[in-house]
Interface confidence: low
């Protein structure tokens, strides 16, 4: 089968599976809402055991020299059935294997020269990145692990020739502000590539990223905040210089709000991010003083 055909087949299969999964999750949520309004039905069959999500791999995104530091493991993922509960176990594992194989097929073929020469390549790369990020939140840890590796492999292979597209796809996932694992996967990778954004694109990226970072700072998941705290210094080192005073203050206020969190992790990550934002702003001393005054105000 031609490379392009294989790719499209894998795309379609993965996409339809992920859509089914999302529909099932929505149905389950609707059922739960209905159950809250009705007398309780007989107990459902027990859900599958929770799978703790492994943290991102310690291997770096780039061949050398800087590996992305691994955030600590997040809490276990939700015990959402990835297929209807009455399906036989054998069928479940087959679909998991299929998803792993589809990821690997996409991964191998998207870096193939024959696909790179296709006029559709930019679009295909966008779909591939979207699917890998989607699979980063798969219910099965094996699928997540392969999706994580595929992201690394594709970025490593294509960053010389297709960096702007890769950056754009990661940015789109951050903007989406979706599942924690997918968001984290995009966030730390975007941060790793931020220093490679062309100077003329830095200001547009900054303007678009600011609301995303502000929104992400409001996420309740500690794992997201850990990843955000690791990403902010790298993002700000690249784009901080392009921010005006007002933009820096908006971003600082978002993290200052987190200093009141009941979670020590969120307080710690917020403090680190706030310092980093000041450090990489145009007026470092001014913002350090501004931050200090705000913090003293919180104490009074």
């Amino acid at each position: 089968m031609a490379t392009l055909e294989k790719l499209m087949k894998a795309f379609e299969s993965l996409k339809s599976f992920q859509q089914q999964q999302q529909q099932q999750q929505q149905q389950q949520q609707q059922q739960q809402q209905q159950q809250q309004q009705q007398p309780p039905p007989p107990p459902p069959p027990p859900p599958p055991p929770q799978l703790p999500q492994p943290p991102p791999q310690a291997q770096p995104l780039l061949p050398q020299p800087q590996p992305p530091p691994p955030p600590p493991p997040p809490p276990p993922g939700p015990a959402v059935a990835e297929e209807p509960l009455h399906r036989p176990k054998k069928e479940l594992s087959a679909t998991k294997k299929d998803r792993v194989n589809h990821c690997l097929t996409i991964c191998e073929n998207i870096v193939a020269q024959s696909v790179r020469n296709s006029p559709e390549f930019q679009k295909l790369l966008g779909i591939a990145m979207e699917l890998f990020l989607l699979c980063s939140d798969d219910a099965e840890s094996d699928v997540r692990m392969v999706a994580d590796e595929c992201l690394n492999k594709v970025i490593k292979a294509l960053m010389d020739s297709n960096l702007p597209r890769l950056q754009l796809e990661l940015y789109k996932e951050i903007k989406k502000n979706g599942a924690p694992r997918s968001l984290r996967a995009a966030l730390w990778r975007f941060a790793e590539l931020a220093h490679l954004v062309r100077p003329q694109k830095c200001r547009p990226y900054l303007v678009n990223l600011l609301p995303c970072l502000t929104r992400t700072s409001k996420r309740p998941e500690e794992s997201v905040q850990e990843t955000l705290a690791a990403a902010v210094p790298k993002i700000m080192a690249s784009f901080g210089n392009f921010a005006n005073d007002n933009e820096i203050k908006v971003l600082l206020k978002a993290f200052i709000a987190n200093l009141k969190s009941s979670s020590p992790t969120i307080r710690r990550t917020a403090a680190g991010s706030a310092v980093s934002i000041c450090q990489h702003s145009r007026r470092t001393q001014y913002f350090y003083s501004w931050l200090l005054n705000v913090l003293l105000g919180l104490l009074v």
Epitope: P54, P70, E149
Partner: antibody, heavy 119, light 107 residues
Amino acid sequence: EVQLVETGGGFVQPGGSLRLSCAASGFNFGSYAMSWVRQAPGKGLEWVSDISGIGSNTYYADSVKGRFTISRDNSDNTLYLDMSSLRAEDTARYYCAKDRKRSGWYEQWGQGTLVTVSS
Amino acid sequence: EIVMTQSPATLTLSPGERATLSCRASQSISAYLGWYQQKPGQAPRLLIYDASIRATGIPDRFSGSGSGTDFTLTISSLEPEDSAVYYCHQRSKWPLTFGGGTKVEIK
């Protein structure tokens, strides 16, 4: 229970080759990055090489780059280290190590296999 | 490469005493530092990772601290079985590197 068993060590002359194997059991091998770390007699630990879960990413210490190749067979739960152009300074106990929940830290180690390069 | 320097080379203390082992990185490694314990004839054992998190099954007398370039492993009250060589290890940048080790001897 996680077990890592290294084999393949032995005596070899300078310039020779050797293949080390690490048989893994008790965990989902393909889901974890694996590493080789060595220790020269009476000396400290030295990182040699890492390989990611599906084997798409490999990393080497400068001292072995171009001479050593790390690989894995996930169907067989085995990690390999192919060593060529061996030198006297490669003499060491070679440990295979398993990643801790894919965070990079070496949570499980084998007992090591001794490689002696001498004429 | 990042050079990890451990001090002292040897530490001789009595049971019940507090041991403080130091590890310095030649450049900032954030908190991506681990500590391993190795007893004679045995493989190393992970004690602390991410600078301060105790690995599974490690007694709470072991604690880690520090970030950036300066790190400390503290054994709050030495036990005879703590006699070993302790290595620090950075996973911040490739190539990965270990410190030269600190030998802890119990009088």
